[in-house]
């Protein structure tokens, strides 16, 4: 359905408030260093222009594409070259190359100051003084730090953010009311950003087919009563939504997501019995709720998969006539029967099945060739099961902090070239799999753990891509999306690594560590642990544990001392000497 003016079409569909918010998100995700005020000015200009097009779709420039309009607007920024360097060269290009150029310059780890949370009273005053600016600032700060954040979902976060301030700034104990809510939003926001980053990486690095396969598996687990044709329709629509958002087409993305939510709710009888509550909510909550809805119950008496996919004489005929449809049906049928499997495992099984058919449907005796294909699945299923069992046992034995430390050591030994902040961030997140997933019963552990690990390892991949330092990381990240986790799991100690030179400064600590939050203090200690392993990659667990125990005792002792700084200076030197001796540095 072609519209004379795309910008007018989206303005009318989304409404002014959402239009402005989405344009702000889009601009902040592209120009991540620009000041807030500059973005607000650009957004206001675009909004005023959109209104003229709503009034008269034939008005000058109203027929231009959104990329052209937004790109032209971004290219008016005066300090583009000084602030962004070569990104300014994008402006010399024509659409669609210009937009592709902007996309390529999105920075997953922008050099921006950490967001420091002001005092509650300060925040409440700012909220009351100018609610609109306060909420825009939230969108801006999140969007520029998370350039792939799922824009329509960020609108939902902003709505919750507003609700938290509206409620808590009137409460007797503002802090007790507000801070837990803000912590929850922050943690959920980070998780949401990372999940969306994997979707965009899947689309951009591995293509639409890879994303569609992921979506078939996930939606089939979630909606096992839905017919294959219904799941296929949802997959097609969902792929369009995410392709748009990942491509910076945020207005189209939000609009199409709303249409998809509407369709799902209108057809919930043929999709899932679990959608009723979601579909009673307002739009943003509804879309979020649908995205998080629990798996429906599996239909009773589903027949064996072997009949259609192994025993049938038409297996090769069906495969050859429509490969992706047949493989899609296989994935659908397998996934709806296995909510207990991770999506990535299901995709590995489908890949194995595809490889077998590619081979066997060219063989002299196809049936004999593929007859045992399901037997090949057994080791693929057992590998993540065993890994999760072992790691959950380790987590229960150690607790989260020490489990993270075990992973820090493990991953630093695998890929010691990776920067210390990245190793700390990624290993801490990998370690969170324990508290997130190990509490679940067996049937829910694998989908929770392995699909979460896929999200975390994607963080490593996108951070590493910006400044590649390890061929092993590049190999695991680029060879196969679904085999990333097994690839990293299989890495042993990097024997080619030349240990880092010892630098006493790295292990010098000051009294400021005492005032840090428990989390920040952990990060300091974990940073030291990574550096230690980089200096002594062959150190044993016992050696590292002894040094880390001494280090913890040292911090505790000096933080209790009257003259903390002196304690850190003197005891620190002793600790470094003792550690060097213990590790033979």
């Amino acid at each position: 359905d072609a519209h004379k003016s795309e910008v007018a079409h989206r303005f009318k569909d989304l409404g002014e408030e959402n239009f402005k918010a989405l344009v702000l998100i889009a601009f902040a995700q592209y120009l991540q260093q620009c000041p807030f005020e500059d973005h607000v000015k650009l957004v206001n200009e675009v909004t005023e222009f959109a209104k003229t097009c709503v009034a008269d779709e034939s008005a000058e420039n109203c027929d231009k594409s959104l990329h052209t309009l937004f790109g032209d607007k971004l290219c008016t920024v005066a300090t583009l070259r000084e602030t962004y360097g070569e990104m300014a060269d994008c402006c010399a290009k024509q659409e669609p190359e210009r937009n592709e150029c902007f996309l390529q310059h999105k920075d997953d780890n922008p050099n921006l100051p950490r967001l420091v949370r002001p005092e509650v009273d300060v925040m409440c005053t700012a909220f009351h003084d100018n609610e609109e600016t306060f909420l825009k600032k939230y969108l801006y700060e999140i969007a520029r730090r998370h350039p792939y954040f799922y824009a329509p979902e960020l609108l939902f976060f902003a709505k919750r953010y507003k609700a938290a301030f509206t409620e808590c700034c009137q409460a007797a104990d503002k802090a007790a009311c507000l801070l837990p809510k803000l912590d929850e939003l922050r943690d959920e926001g980070k998780a949401s950003s990372a999940k969306q980053r994997l979707k965009c990486a899947s689309l951009q690095k591995f293509g639409e087919r890879a994303f569609k396969a992921w979506a078939v598996a996930r939606l089939s687990q979630r909606f096992p009563k839905a017919e294959f044709a219904e799941v296929s329709k949802l997959v097609t629509d969902l792929t369009k939504v995410h392709t748009e958002c990942c491509h910076g087409d945020l207005l189209e993305c939000a609009d199409d997501r709303a249409d998809l939510a509407k369709y799902i709710c209108e057809n919930q009888d043929s999709i899932s019995s679990k959608l009723k509550e979601c579909c009673e909510k307002p739009l943003l909550e509804k879309s979020h709720c649908i995205a998080e809805v629990e798996n429906d119950e599996m239909p009773a008496d589903l027949p064996s998969l072997a009949a259609d996919f192994v025993e049938s004489k038409d297996v090769c005929k069906n495969y050859a006539e429509a490969k992706d449809v047949f493989l899609g049906m296989f994935l659908y049928e397998y996934a709806r029967r296995h909510p207990d499997y991770s999506v990535v495992l299901l995709l590995r099984l489908a890949k194995t099945y595809e490889t077998t058919l590619e081979k066997c449907c060219a063989a002299a005796d196809p049936h004999e060739c593929y007859a045992k294909v399901f037997d090949e699945f057994k080791p693929l299923v057992e590998e993540p099961q065993n890994l999760i069992k072992q790691n959950c046992e380790l987590f229960e034995q150690l607790g989260e902090y020490k489990f993270q430390n075990a992973l820090l050591v493990r991953y630093t030994k695998k890929v010691p070239q990776v920067s210390t902040p990245t190793l700390v961030e990624v290993s801490r997140n990998l370690g969170k799999v324990g508290s997130k997933c190990c509490k679940h019963p067996e049937a829910k552990r694998m989908p929770c753990a392995e699909d979460y690990l896929s999200v975390v390892l994607n963080q490593l991949c996108v951070l590493h891509e910006k400044t590649p330092v390890s061929d092993r990381v590049t190999k695991c990240c680029t060879e196969s999306l679904v085999n990333r986790r097994p690839c990293f799991s299989a890495l042993e100690v990097d024997e080619t690594y030349v240990p880092k030179e010892f630098n006493a400064e790295t292990f010098t600590f000051h009294a400021d560590i005492c005032t840090l939050s428990e989390k920040e203090r952990q990060i300091k200690k974990q940073t030291a642990l990574v550096e230690l392993v980089k200096h002594k990659p062959k150190a044993t667990k016992e050696q590292l544990k002894a040094v880390m125990d001494d280090f913890a005792a040292f911090v505790e002792k000096c933080c209790k001392a009257d003259d903390k700084e002196t304690c850190f200076a003197e005891e620190g030197k002793k600790l470094v000497a003792a550690s060097q001796a213990a590790l033979g540095l």
Epitope: A320, C361, A362, A363, E368, C369
Partner: antibody, heavy 118, light 106 residues
Framework: QVQLQQSGAELVRPGSSVKISCKAS????????MNWVKQRPGQGLEWIGQ????????YYNGRFKGKATLTADKSPTTAYMQLSSLTSEDSAVYVC???????????WGQGTTLTVSS | QIVLTQSPAIMSASPGEKVTMTCSAS?????MHWYQQKSGTSPKRWIY???KLASGVPVRFSGSGSGTSYSLTIRSMEAEDAATYYC?????????FGAGTKLEIK
Amino acid sequence: QVQLQQSGAELVRPGSSVKISCKASGYAFSNYWMNWVKQRPGQGLEWIGQIYPGDGDTYYNGRFKGKATLTADKSPTTAYMQLSSLTSEDSAVYVCARGVLLGSFDYWGQGTTLTVSS
Amino acid sequence: QIVLTQSPAIMSASPGEKVTMTCSASSSVSYMHWYQQKSGTSPKRWIYDTSKLASGVPVRFSGSGSGTSYSLTIRSMEAEDAATYYCQQWGSNPLTFGAGTKLEIK
């Protein structure tokens, strides 16, 4: 582009063995069956067997079991057929051919002429 | 094993004439493929998966059939079509070829 280059003509004594090669290029050698076909002068085509270089799986025409042995080497992307206990009946042109989905042979080598004579 | 019988063994056709040759299988087969061979050269895949034309094959050729009965048709014979045509079945081990139909130009 896909190419199958076979070794040159062979003249051998009865009772001996011969190994014919087929060097593949221009495609993922491991992922396609390599078939071998026999053609005697003025006669039709006879399928000998096939090998899957990816894992070494083979299928043979029963008539050639014990006569032909198929192997493949992934690093020089070459398939081989060894013929043993040769007799004049084995004199023929032997051709390698790449097998694809649903069993057709889309690319063929130029053929190797084997003459068994005392 | 499945025996493929091609008929006729030899045939000739004038330029512009319609040509049909058949391949009959001793049991039902899944797919039939056809190859063209000219003297002194290796066979070339001509029609595959029963009815698909191989790359570069003129559209005057067509293939059809199912079960035990298959055919190759040339809508309008041309001189360059003179060759031997072999059918080959897939779906039963061992793979087998017909004895060939030799097509000559009148």
